[in-house]
């Protein structure tokens, strides 16, 4: 017998859509072979209607698709706008139509429920609103208006014009009688439930002259949209529930056991602990739509997600909802990278960020996730030479090692740097990744003076002491600027005496600045690396002042002053306020990217779900003239 499995019978009605799942053993060969959906002919052949290789029959043009989910060993055939002509016997299968790897499916499309003459059909999504219109004649204008629901053989009163409301509809139904000019009354039912579906009868008057109108209410549960994303990658759920719920609390929940739907995030400030640091609820538009971004996808994130609107911020019967079935592909194109990076206070971290190697020219960003409200991620640095002012001299984004990975170095760590950071680009939005920085107890490995003052025209020598554990590493000095850290010549002065219990392999490497000029003022880093992979760094601020007496300065660890409290920008720069404008590309929308660098006089984009808030100053490597 065939190992392919699926629904033997599918019954639907005209105008509807069907979503037929076919199951196959997920062997390597099966995963990659052709998938097809064909219609069986009277003479035994099977005519292909759609296949995974891109073929779509003219009969299915614009109304069908076939999606393969190799990780689960399934493929799904969606067919919309069904007509009775679609009724028949079909096969879903693998390989060639005439071979045995297939499953027989009977599709029956009927005209719809057996409706009484003159029945108006209302097809409405779960949680939405329906308005049932009931015409009447003049002689019944002053008489009682009512709506009944057919339960089995008996009509049950739902609402009438004398004020009765059936308890099942309390708080979500009203009866409106139009102005005198219109011979029509309407019954409006909100927050539709699946149990509301059925045959209704509206009536004006109670005698033999009463006017009656039949209505058939079909309440559709949303078919989950299938979403297939890579492990460690990112997913965006776009939720459009309509303007009628624009002011109602929104939520995203994940169905667990039974009808329980555990809130993942909502607009009332709730967020599931498992999503801490890797979720943002993008602010809703005026039409009530919103989106939720989840990064760092894990295997256990797979499942059915519902977004909806309800004052409680969680799923209730009658919530308008949208549904997704998320599959997390473990054969991920996104490489493994550490999800937690630990750094010692006063020292540094070097974070490796993956990106889609096909997009090497994309702009790279690094942002700090903030949990307040619905989550936001203001940018700290980008690959175009912008660094947030508070991070000057201690944060750098490097294109190295390249080929699908960039590096972010953050030094002068304090406990306030602990938190979640996102790596992202203005390209493939699925490649957003999250890393948590933890600050741990300990001493920095590299020893440098605090801040140093150099004298114009003189020579300055700044020491950096490397312990023996870094004997096999390349040691360097560089000058920090917004675009990175430009390497400088340095001198190996032999073993360092700054470390106890450290042998001849420790090293003192000095930076020498000859004939110091004003341009030498700024931040200098010493650090270690292996090839294009960076390790620990330490930062020194060099101030430049005038001095009458000539000579050179040689700075030791003992002579070092405390680091300056505040760095004053030279007059050629000005601090640029960051208005946290929303970069639409940071939320998976297929729009062209405008370079946000010079928008709003140099303000920067932020992955943000709050209002426009001041982000603090920012600096750039080019001058802004007033």
């Amino acid at each position: 017998k065939s190992p392919i499995f699926g629904p033997e019978e599918v019954n639907s009605v005209e105008g509807n859509s069907v979503s037929i799942t076919c199951y196959y053993p997920p062997t390597s060969v099966n995963r990659h072979t052709r998938k097809y959906w064909c219609r069986q002919g009277a003479r035994g052949g099977c005519i292909t209607l759609i296949s995974s290789e891109g073929y779509v029959s003219s009969k299915y043009a614009g109304r069908a698709n076939l999606t393969n989910f190799p990780e689960n060993g399934t493929f799904v055939v969606n067919i919309a706008q069904l007509s009775q002509d679609d009724s028949g016997r079909y096969k879903c299968g693998l390989g060639i139509n005439s071979r045995g790897l297939s499953f027989d499916v009977s599709l029956e499309v009927s005209q719809g429920p057996g409706l009484l003459n003159d029945t108006k059909v209302y097809t409405v999504d779960l949680g939405r609103t329906v308005t049932i219109n009931c015409p009447f004649k003049t002689e019944n204008a002053q008489k009682r208006k009512s709506l009944y629901k057919q339960i089995g053989l008996y009509p049950v009163l739902v609402i009438d014009s004398s004020g009765y409301v059936n308890p099942n509809y309390t708080g979500r139904i009203r009866l409106d009688i139009q102005g005198t000019g219109q011979l029509l009354f309407s019954v409006v039912i909100n927050q539709l439930r699946l149990s509301d579906a059925g045959q209704y009868l509206c009536q004006a008057g109670d005698d033999s002259n009463s006017n009656k109108k039949n209505a058939d209410l079909q309440v559709l549960k949303p078919e989950p949209e299938l979403v297939y994303e890579d492990l460690r990658g990112s997913v965006t759920f776009h939720c459009a529930l309509g303007p009628e719920v624009a002011n109602v609390a929104k939520f995203l929940c994940r169905q667990s056991s039974g009808e329980n739907c555990d809130v993942v995030v909502n607009t009332l400030g709730k967020r599931a602990p498992a999503f801490e640091g890797r979720i943002l609820l993008n602010p809703q538009d005026k039409d009530g739509s919103f989106s939720v971004v989840i990064t760092g996808l894990r295997k256990e994130d797979a499942g059915r997600y519902l977004c909806g609107a309800h004052s409680d911020g969680q799923l209730q019967e009658g919530s308008p909802i949208q549904a997704w079935q998320l599959f997390v592909n473990e054969e991920s194109t996104i490489p493994r990278s550490p999800t937690v990076v630990k750094g010692v206070a006063g020292s540094s971290v070097a974070v490796l960020c993956p990106y889609n190697r096909k997009e090497s020219k994309s702009i790279k960003y690094w942002c700090l996730w903030e949990g307040a409200q619905n989550g936001r991620c203001p940018l700290l640095v980008d690959s175009e030479g912008w660094v947030k002012a508070q991070y000057e001299g201690r944060l750098s984004l490097l294109e190295e090692p390249g080929n699908g990975t960039f590096t972010v170095i953050l030094n002068q760590l304090t406990s306030r740097d602990a938190g979640f950071y996102w790596c992202l680009t203005n390209g493939d939005t699925l490649w957003r990744t999250t890393v948590e920085i933890k600050i741990i107890e300990g001493e920095p490995n590299l020893k440098v003076p605090g801040n140093v003052t150099a004298v114009l025209g003189e020579t300055l020598k700044v020491p950096c002491h490397f312990p023996c554990k870094f004997s096999s590493y390349e040691k360097y000095w560089c000058k920090w600027n917004n675009t990175g850290c430009q390497a400088l010549p340095s001198q190996d002065e032999g073993p360092s005496k700054a470390f106890v219990n450290c042998d001849e392999n420790s090293r003192l490497v000095s930076l020498t600045l000859n004939l110091v000029t004003r341009a030498d003022e700024g931040w200098y880093w010493c650090g270690v690396k292996q090839g294009h992979f960076y390790g620990e760094t330490a930062a020194v601020y060099v101030a430049v002042e005038e001095r009458k007496a000539a000579g050179s300065r040689d700075v030791s660890l003992a002579k070092a002053d405390a680091a300056p409290d505040e760095k004053v920008l030279d007059s050629g720069f000005r601090e640029i306020e960051n208005k946290a404008i929303q970069d639409p590309r940071l939320f998976a929308e297929e729009k062209a990217v405008a370079d946000t660098r010079d928008q709003a006089d140099g303000s920067r984009a932020s992955v943000d779900s709050g209002s426009s808030e001041e982000q603090g100053g920012s600096s750039r490597h080019h001058h802004h003239h007033h």
Epitope: E9, S12, S19, I20, G303, E317
Partner: nanobody
Framework: EVQLVESGGGLVQAGDSLRLSCAAS????????VGWFRQAPGKEREFVTT??????????YYADSVKGRFTISRDNAKNTVYLQMNSLKPDDTAVYYC?????????????????WGQGTQVTVSS
């Protein structure tokens, strides 16, 4: 919570018919599919049939061993799913369980179902 109650089991002769019912109560508004499984003494629970739905579309799945003999159906108004069993064989003897699911990735897998009834005994004598 969703409660499921099976009924209609009993003792029949080979070749006879039987109709099982599964009545659901409680918060059924998120239910997506209802299936029947069976378990014979000393054997594992096995898939028999499942019906899933979306709006007015129904999908019916059957195990090879019951194809052409068993039919699953549902009555939405009564929140009840039926299993019509024709041409019964002694091999069909088992406790039949009704199960409901909110998310069904593969209808044949018992662990995909969130709610289970207590079961009803079907005995087919030769």
């Amino acid at each position: 919570e969703v409660q499921l109650v099976e009924s209609g089991g009993g003792l029949v002769q080979a070749g006879d018919s039987l109709r099982l019912s599964c009545a659901a109560s409680g918060r059924t508004f998120t239910t997506y599919g209802v299936g029947w499984f069976r378990q014979a003494p000393g054997k594992e629970r096995e898939f028999v049939t499942t019906i899933t739905w979306s709006g007015s579309t129904n999908y019916k799945y059957y195990a090879d061993s019951v194809k052409g003999r068993f039919t699953i159906s549902r009555d939405n108004a009564k929140n009840t799913v039926y299993l019509q069993m024709n041409s019964l064989k002694p091999d069909d003897t088992a406790v039949y369980y009704c199960a409901a699911s909110t998310v069904l990735t593969d209808p044949r897998v018992p662990t995909e179902y969130d709610y289970w009834g207590q079961g009803t005994q079907v005995t087919v004598s030769s």
